[in-house]
Interface confidence: medium
C-alpha cells in the first residue's frame, strides 16, 4: 500500500535536492572537467567559469590537509604555491578562467577544486586529475558523467579548518540563520529517498552469504565498483 | 595555521573614530581573504567587511560609507578603519580568514568597541 506513494515521492525529492544549489545561491561555478588521465610529465587544463560577480578566484587542492594552489583576481599578480611555481599558467579572466598545470608528477594526483569569492561560498565540482606512469595509463580511466557544482553560503559564525586561506562573503542576516534548519531538512529528505531508491533498487550491493556457523550469522558484503571509476567523485565537501 | 590578534578598541562618543588592527602571524595571510566580523550582546556574529589578496573589498550594508577595511601584506595585518560610530556598532570585533570563518571553531579574543555618550 505505501509502494506507489514512496515511488511518488522519489522524483520529487530527487529534483528537490538537485534544486537546492541554485536555491542557496544565485552563482555557480562552472568547472571543467570532472576527471582527467594524464601521464608523468604531461599538462592539464582546469577552467572555472562563473556567471559574474566575483571578486577573485581560488583553485584549491583537497585532502586531509587541504592547500590552495593558486589564487587569482583581475588585475593583481597571480599568487602561486611554490610547490607549482613556474609550472602554472592562466589563460582568460576571473570570470572564466582556464589554469595550465605543466610537468605533472604522481605526487600531484588529486582532487582540484575551484573556490569563488563572491557574495557566497561557492565551489567548483573538482576536478579529479590522475596522473599516472606513461605504461600503465590505459589501467586508468575516466567517465562522462559529470558531478554538479555546488554553491553554498558560508554561515557567519565560526569554526576552523587546518590550512586557513579564506573566503566567505556577506550573507544575508536572515537567510544565513534559517540555513541550517533548512539543510537539515533537505539532508532528511533527501536522505529518506536515498532510503527509499536502495530499497527499491538494490542492484549495486551483492550479499553474498556464503556460510554460517550457530555462532555467527556472518554475511560478507561486496560492492560492485565495476563501472564506478571516475563516477565516485562528487562535489567537494566544502568543510575540507 | 594563522594566528590572530585584533586591538584597537575601546570606548568612543558617537559620531567618533576608532581603527581596530588585526596582526596575523603565517605565512598564508598574504593569499588569504580577510574578513572584520562582530557581535554584539545576544547576537549572532556577522561579517562586517572583508578584503581579498588583491585589495578588493565588500561591505555589510549596515556600515558602508562608515566603514574601510584594508591590509598590508608586508606587515602581516589587516585594519578596519570605523568612522561616524552609532551607538549600534557596540560590539566585540574580531578578525578572521574569510572562506573559513563560517567553519571555525576558534576565534580570538576580539576587541570591544563601545560606543556611547
Known amino acids: 500500500m505505501a509502494g506507489p506513494p514512496r515511488l511518488l515521492l522519489l522524483p520529487l525529492l530527487l529534483a528537490l535536492a538537485r534544486g537546492l544549489p541554485g536555491a542557496l545561491a544565485a552563482q555557480e561555478v562552472q568547472q571543467s572537467p570532472h576527471c582527467t588521465t594524464v601521464p608523468v610529465g604531461a599538462s592539464v587544463n582546469i577552467t572555472c567559469s562563473t556567471s559574474g560577480g566575483l571578486r577573485g578566484i581560488y583553485l584549491r587542492q583537497l585532502g586531509p590537509q587541504p592547500q590552495d594552489i593558486i589564487y587569482y583576481e583581475d588585475g593583481v599578480v597571480p599568487t602561486t604555491d611554490r610547490r607549482f611555481r613556474g609550472r602554472i599558467d592562466f589563460s582568460g579572466s576571473q570570470d572564466n578562467l582556464t589554469i595550465t598545470m605543466h610537468r605533472l608528477q604522481l605526487s600531484d594526483t588529486g582532487t582540484y577544486t575551484c573556490q569563488a569569492i563572491t557574495e557566497v561560498n561557492v565551489y567548483g565540482s573538482g576536478t579529479l586529475v590522475l596522473v599516472t606512469e606513461e605504461q600503465s595509463q590505459g589501467w586508468h580511466r575516466c567517465s562522462d558523467a559529470p558531478p554538479r557544482a555546488s554553491a553554498l553560503p558560508a554561515p557567519p559564525t565560526g569554526s576552523a579548518l587546518p590550512d586557513p586561506q579564506t573566503a566567505s562573503a556577506l550573507p544575508d542576516p536572515p537567510a544565513a540563520s534559517a540555513l541550517p534548519a533548512a539543510l537539515a531538512v533537505i539532508s532528511f529528505l533527501l536522505g529518506l529517498g536515498l532510503g527509499v531508491a536502495c530499497v527499491l533498487a538494490r542492484t549495486q550491493i551483492k550479499k553474498l552469504c556464503s556460510w554460517r556457523d550457530k555462532n555467527s550469522a556472518a554475511c560478507v558484503v561486496y560492492e560492485d565498483m565495476s563501472h564506478s571509476r571516475c563516477n565516485t567523485l562528487s562535489s567537494p565537501n566544502q568543510y575540507q | 595555521q594563522v594566528q590572530l590578534q585584533e586591538s584597537g578598541g575601546g570606548l568612543v562618543q558617537p559620531g567618533g573614530s576608532l581603527r581596530l588592527s588585526c596582526a596575523a602571524s603565517?605565512?598564508?595571510?598574504?593569499?588569504?581573504?580577510m574578513g572584520w566580523y562582530r557581535q554584539a550582546p545576544g547576537k549572532q556574529r556577522d561579517l562586517v567587511a572583508s578584503i581579498t589578496p588583491g585589495g578588493n573589498t565588500t561591505y555589510a550594508d549596515f556600515v558602508k560609507g562608515r566603514f574601510t577595511i584594508s591590509r598590508d601584506n608586508a606587515k602581516n595585518t589587516v585594519y578596519l578603519q570605523m568612522n561616524s560610530l552609532k551607538p549600534e556598532d557596540t560590539a566585540v570585533y574580531y578578525c578572521?580568514?574569510?572562506?573559513?570563518?563560517?567553519?571555525?571553531?576558534?576565534w580570538g579574543q576580539g576587541t570591544q568597541v563601545t560606543v556611547s555618550s
Open positions: 603565517g605565512s598564508k595571510f598574504s593569499i588569504a581573504t
Open positions: 578572521n580568514d574569510f572562506r573559513l570563518a563560517g567553519l571555525r571553531d576558534y
